[in-house]
């Protein structure tokens, strides 16, 4: 038994002092708008559907349902004595999905269609989500909405990022087969895009692949082989989506940077960090040219985003994912250097422009501190004994350092007697020497090692 | 794993013929030309000729023209050398061997070779 | 045809040594590639494009030159690096040195 203090309907009058469920009406097996209370709240009886009239006499709203009364003002019980008649409308407005696949206006829908579905022996529809089917949940104050910036600036940018793929000839056959792939990001409407040199070494045949699945032959515009930075483009009737670069120069270590990439097609890859170091010491990882400077980030770079773009939160490039040298210690060629790229090759095509030469020996390179030492002696058990110098990350194939037997994982410690405490060391002689001769630790054991630097292009 | 698997030794007579297999798993057959090398007792590797899997196209040593024939089936994975007119001197191992090809340098090798199977050509 | 001239034919030398096998051709090549092949076995690809290291091959192993003349080294031999070397070459179809057969000491 319900006392009045129990009930949920407002007191009516001509009401009982106690509920007795034995004097109830006996109800329907099925009722259009579900189950209600009566305006004692006493007995369950059908509730009035969506639309329906309700207040006066003709009894309560459906579950889920509310009386309204014109204006929207809902009803009550100084309403209903005013005798005003109102109709039933559903509490909640915001259409949902069902589990039968079909989206409903609202809450009170879906259940109406329960309530048939159940008549009928099939199963209840129930609520999949919120939002229409094939919708996400568009809710703006949930925390999913208010806190998934990584995703907020991924869906932003993936648009333009590319999937690139590269094609080799068999020997004899002459016959193409795909051989390697890697990602780039448009920079122009009008097709323009950019990746690593390394992605579409050895004039490769190039595909470009864009996110909706369009495929296009690309035409390698310009290489900077030394910066690490080339420039295509494909031929693409209407305006593509576009990345804006950032400045890299404005990075400030423990900044959020996304790394996304399209490793595989009509898939983007997505990694994510913060910057480590910015700009490594102008020349610190002199890589290939004497003003190389590299971000540094523990966002995951590998062969499928290494091409593409390292964004920052407002979605600007600033930097070219370009390669990972161990666990958790990744670096990206800074946009500002992509941008002086750019402005050089512009000019190149535009006036064939003479370049003034650098010396160049073929090396990627870090300065050795105690620190990275030690943390590169716990990961490889063989690396040198040694706490200062300049450590090779990666020797470029056909240069000069490649001819001379340098190795990756080779410590210069000195060069033409000096001896060598940092990368910018190795920089500076470079610049001044004709000869470099190098001693360099392998292992546990000093070579002597002559290379000649070339003169190239800048 | 790449395997590249050859059968067994044979003995022939001068003048007969001879077919060896190699089953090929590990990767996409038809990615990759298939190459046949020689090796007689004491001397140099000596290349024989390649097969692209996919077309059939077939590329020849003009040492061997005439005499060698290299097939491939795709659904199978194999590929086929075939030598006629055996003579004393073929008497050799012969190695299937997969084309490599260097990415950074555009070079090509032989990256994967099969155990080799040994010809006996003897009256 | 690209004629190749493989130096030593054969030599001898203790564990530890600095072992050097050069290798001519008679018309400049882009790369070469050097092979190890132990009795009874197929041949295993060591340097691939002249200097790069093929996958699992120890460091002691490296690879030089340029145009027609080219080198081969082992830092410091071990016992199971007895075997004969080849030099290949791939200009327009492959060719190989006649080896260099290198023993212990």
């Known amino acids: 038994q319900l006392s009045r203090a129990g009930r949920s309907a407002p007191l009516a009058a001509g009401c009982p002092d106690r509920c007795e469920p034995a004097r109830c009406p006996p109800q329907p097996e099925h009722c259009e708008g579900g189950r209600a209370r009566d305006a004692c709240g006493c007995c369950e009886v059908c509730g009035a559907p969506e639309g329906a009239a309700c207040g006066l006499q003709e009894g309560p709203c459906g579950e889920g349902l509310q009386c309204v009364v014109p204006f929207g003002v809902p009803a009550s019980a100084t309403v209903r004595r005013r005798a005003q008649a109102g109709l039933c409308v559903c509490a909640s407005s915001e259409p949902v999905c069902g589990s039968d696949a079909n989206t409903y206006a609202n809450l009170c829908q879906l259940r109406a269609a329960s309530r048939r579905s159940e008549r009928l022996h099939r199963p209840p529809v129930i609520v999949l989500q919120r939002g229409a089917c094939g919708q996400g949940q568009e809710d703006p104050n949930s925390l999913r909405h208010k806190y998934n910036f990584i995703a907020d600036v991924v869906e932003k940018i993936a648009p333009a990022v590319v999937h690139i793929e590269l094609f080799r000839k068999l020997p004899f056959s002459k016959r193409e087969v795909p051989v390697a792939s890697g990602s780039g990001f448009i920079v122009s409407e009008d097709g323009l895009i950019v990746t690593n040199a390394h992605v579409v070494t050895n004039k490769h045949r190039v595909k470009v692949e864009l996110k909706n699945g369009a495929t296009y032959e690309a035409k390698i515009k310009d290489v900077d082989e030394k910066a690490d930075i080339a420039l295509i483009k494909i031929d693409h009737q209407g305006k593509l989506p576009v990345l804006l670069l950032g400045r890299s120069s404005e990075l400030r270590p423990g900044e959020f940077v996304v790394a996304i990439g399209s490793p595989f097609s009509l898939q983007n890859t997505v990694t994510t960090g913060i910057v480590s170091t910015t700009q490594r010491g102008g020349k610190e990882l002199g890589l290939r040219n004497s003003d190389m400077d590299y971000i540094q980030t523990d966002a995951i770079i590998n062969y499928g985003n290494s091409g593409g773009p390292l964004v920052n939160l407002d979605g600007e490039v600033i930097g070219i994912n370009t390669l990972k040298v161990t666990a958790g210690i990744s670096f990206a060629i800074p946009s500002d250097k992509i941008k002086k790229f750019l402005t050089e090759s512009h000019d190149r095509q535009a006036k064939g422009k003479a370049i003034t030469k650098k010396k160049y020996i073929g090396i990627r390179m870090m300065s050795l501190t105690s620190s990275k030492a030690k943390e590169l002696k716990d990961r490889h058990r063989d690396f040198p004994d040694v706490i200062s110098g300049a450590y090779i990350i990666e020797v470029i194939p056909d240069t000069p350092a490649e001819a001379g037997g340098l190795k990756e994982n080779d410590v210069i410690i000195s060069i033409n007697g000096q001896s060598v405490v940092s990368a910018n060391d190795v920089s500076d002689v470079i610049k001044r020497e004709s000869t470099l001769n190098m001693v360099v630790r392998r292992g546990n054991e000093d070579i002597m090692i002559t290379v000649i630097p070339e003169e190239i292009d800048p | 794993q790449v395997q590249l698997v050859q059968s067994g030794a044979e003995v022939k007579k001068p003048g007969a013929s001879v077919k060896v297999s190699c089953k090929a798993s590990g990767y996409t057959f038809t990615d990759y030309e298939m190459h046949w090398v020689r090796q007689a007792p004491g001397q140099r590797l000596e290349w024989m000729g390649a097969?692209?899997?996919?077309?059939?196209?077939?590329a020849y040593n003009q040492k061997f023209k005439g005499r060698v024939t290299i097939t491939a089936d795709k659904s199978a994975s194999t590929a086929y050398m075939e030598l006629s007119s055996l003579r004393s001197e073929d008497t050799a191992v012969y190695y299937c061997?997969?084309?490599?090809?260097?990415?950074?340098?555009?070079?090509?090798?032989?990256?994967?070779w099969g155990q080799g199977t040994l010809v006996t050509v003897s009256s | 045809d690209i004629q190749m001239t493989q130096s030593p034919s054969s030599l001898s030398a203790s564990v530890g040594d600095r072992v050097t096998i050069t290798c001519s051709v008679s018309s400049s090549v882009s790369y070469m590639y050097w092979y190890q092949q132990k009795p009874g076995k197929a041949p295993k690809l060591l340097i691939y494009?002249?200097?790069n290291l093929a996958s699992g091959v120890p460091s002691r192993f490296s690879g030089s030159g340029s145009g027609t003349d080219f080198t081969f080294t082992i830092s410091s031999l071990q016992p199971e690096d007895i075997a004969t070397y080849y030099c290949q070459q791939w200009s327009y179809y492959p060719t190989f040195g006649q080896g260099t057969k290198l023993e212990i000491k």
């Open positions: 061997t997969r084309e490599g090809y260097s990415y950074e340098g555009g070079g090509y090798y032989f990256d994967y």
């Open positions: 097969i692209d899997p996919e077309t059939g196209g077939t």
């Open positions: 494009d002249t200097s």
